[in-house]
């Protein structure tokens, strides 16, 4: 708490300008009017105040707006935003995408802080859903943003927003998240032709079921090994050797390098060795000739 002292003669601030740069902590407290500060917040960023001085300015705004800052002030907080706590931000009602952008710009280059996470949460909840413009903005600043959301939160993403998603935005998503995003992507890109569709859907395929992979194998898509390795193991296991060969096209040779890793390892164990031999890659570990394969899961389903 800053001690209340009278402002020295001639030091009362008439403007928020650089004449305040070297004011001591107590001088700022005594000589800067909070209402003046609120109306001239946009000037603070241009002035090289120290962290300590910014703390004083924040304190003045907190006193003026104990229930939370109005959006007119929030939009111009600039670097003062970095001084806000998640508790401060929870009091805000941010509705403008321009305000969100302005504050995210300030945090650029930093990891997503608790303050930013709280701000985004407040903004998205206020909008009711993660619309395309918001998603566009958030993934531009934080490519990993989508993957930080729970599957439940992702369910509120409308398919139309999927157009804003770039491959790198999905790099850190786990299978549970891709399970939610894949059907939305499928819906969003459904009117595209084969090759264009594959380019768009590729990064979402970690959520694709077996039947969709089988369908893709009929379209000469030439899936790369990196994409194949991210597919759901349970979706890959039912694929035949011929289907995998068609799915990968010229990339099928890469299976040899990945034969010890999932899902390739598990898939190999499910294939007949003589089918694997047709690939000519030297893949080992398939079911030997003459062995009968019982699909117990199918048997249970029938009984």
């Amino acid at each position: 708490e800053v001690e209340k002292t009278a402002c020295p003669s001639g030091k009362k601030a008439r403007e928020i300008d650089e004449s305040l740069i070297f004011y001591k902590k107590w001088e700022l407290e005594a000589c800067v009017d909070a209402a003046l500060l609120a109306t001239q917040m946009d000037r603070v960023n241009a002035i090289p105040f120290t962290y300590e001085q910014l703390d004083v300015l924040k304190h003045k705004l907190d006193e003026l707006y104990p229930q939370g800052y109005p959006e007119s002030v929030i939009q111009h907080l600039g670097y003062l935003f970095l001084k806000m706590s998640p508790e401060d931000i929870r009091k805000w009602n941010v509705t403008s995408l321009e305000t969100l952008k302005a504050l995210l710009e300030v945090n650029k280059g930093h990891e997503m802080s608790p303050q930013v996470a709280t701000l985004i949460d407040r903004f998205v909840k206020g909008r009711g859903q993660l619309d395309k413009d918001t998603l566009d903005t958030l993934t531009a600043f934080y490519p990993g943003y989508l993957c930080s959301l729970s599957p439940e939160e992702l369910s509120s993403v409308p398919p139309s927003s999927i157009w804003a998603v770039r491959p790198q935005d999905l790099d850190t998503c786990d299978p549970r998240q891709l399970d939610v995003l894949y059907p939305k992507a499928r819906l969003a890109f459904q009117n595209m032709n084969g090759s264009e569709y594959f380019v768009k859907i590729q990064s979402f395929l970690g959520g694709a079921p077996t039947e969709d992979l089988k369908a893709l194998s009929q379209q000469n898509v030439s899936m790369d090994l990196a994409t194949f390795m991210k597919l759901r193991t349970d979706a890959v296991l039912p694929l035949t050797v011929a289907e995998v060969q068609k799915l990968l096209g010229p990339h099928v040779e890469g299976l040899k390098a990945e034969e010890r890793h999932r899902p390739v390892r598990d898939w190999i164990l499910r294939q007949r060795q003589d089918d694997l031999d047709t690939l000519g890659l030297g893949l080992q570990g398939g079911i030997p000739n003459g062995y009968l394969v019982l699909d117990l899961s199918m048997q249970e389903a029938l009984s």
Epitope: S19, I21, N45, L54
Partner: antibody, heavy 121, light 106 residues
């Protein structure tokens, strides 16, 4: 190219005066507060003085207060340090440095090569 | 505010992990920067706001800490990293620097 170039250093007797200049290029000079930082031979860095973008506000370390004057000419993109009543302990390399900007970002993202000031009889 | 760096010098080999600490005499939030200086050259900004990497600085450099205790880490020392490193606080005036840490070849 974004750069700062100091000049004006040299040998001066105790009690003498010297004026350092720093020519800035490649950025909007008037938008940034500027500083002088010095480094005595074999020693660490010491912040000496600063001036606001318009030149209206100045700051001095206690060790130079009353003897040094910082100023700038924004039309010439030049920063100055007028050093009077020089002492042996003022011997140092003097660097001109640009502050990153406002909003608490008072670290130096651009430095000049420095100019050596030697105070000796 | 006084900044105390430790150690004042250290010897290390290429590939070593190097840690330098900077302690402030009072809390300075995350208002700390780290600089690298090579003989006869001007300092170069590496880290600002205690942990943010300046553009163009290799990712082997990292900063951490808040309040009074801060650390600069070089994950795998390279030949070009042998230099003197300084911390600087910008929490309040006057801005101050640490005494420096010289990293030498073992």
């Amino acid at each position: 190219e974004v750069q700062l170039l100091e000049s004006g250093g040299g040998l001066v007797q105790p009690g003498g005066s010297l004026r350092l200049s720093c020519a800035a290029s490649g950025f909007t000079f008037s938008s940034y507060a500027m500083s002088w930082v010095r480094q005595a031979p074999g020693k660490g860095l010491e912040w000496v003085s600063a001036i606001s973008g318009s030149g209206g506000s100045t700051y001095y370390a206690d060790s130079v207060k009353g003897r040094f004057t910082i100023s700038r000419d924004n039309s010439k993109n030049t920063l100055y340090l007028q050093m009077n009543s020089l002492r042996a302990e003022d011997t140092a390399v003097y660097y001109c440095a640009k502050w990153m900007g406002g909003g608490g970002r008072l670290y130096f993202d651009l430095w000049g090569r420095g100019t050596l000031v030697t105070v000796s009889s | 505010i006084q900044l105390t760096q430790s150690p004042s010098s250290l010897s290390a080999s290429v590939g070593d992990r190097v840690t330098i600490t900077c302690r402030a005499s009072q809390g300075i939030s995350s208002a700390l920067a780290w600089y690298q200086q090579k003989p006869g050259k001007a300092p170069k900004l590496l880290i600002y706001d205690a942990s943010s990497l300046e553009s163009g600085v290799p990712s082997r450099f990292s900063g951490s800490g808040s309040g009074t205790d801060f650390t600069l880490t070089i994950s795998s020392l390279q030949p070009e990293d042998f230099a003197t490193y300084y911390c600087q606080q910008f929490n309040n005036y006057p801005l101050t620097f640490g005494g420096g840490t010289k990293v030498e070849i073992k």
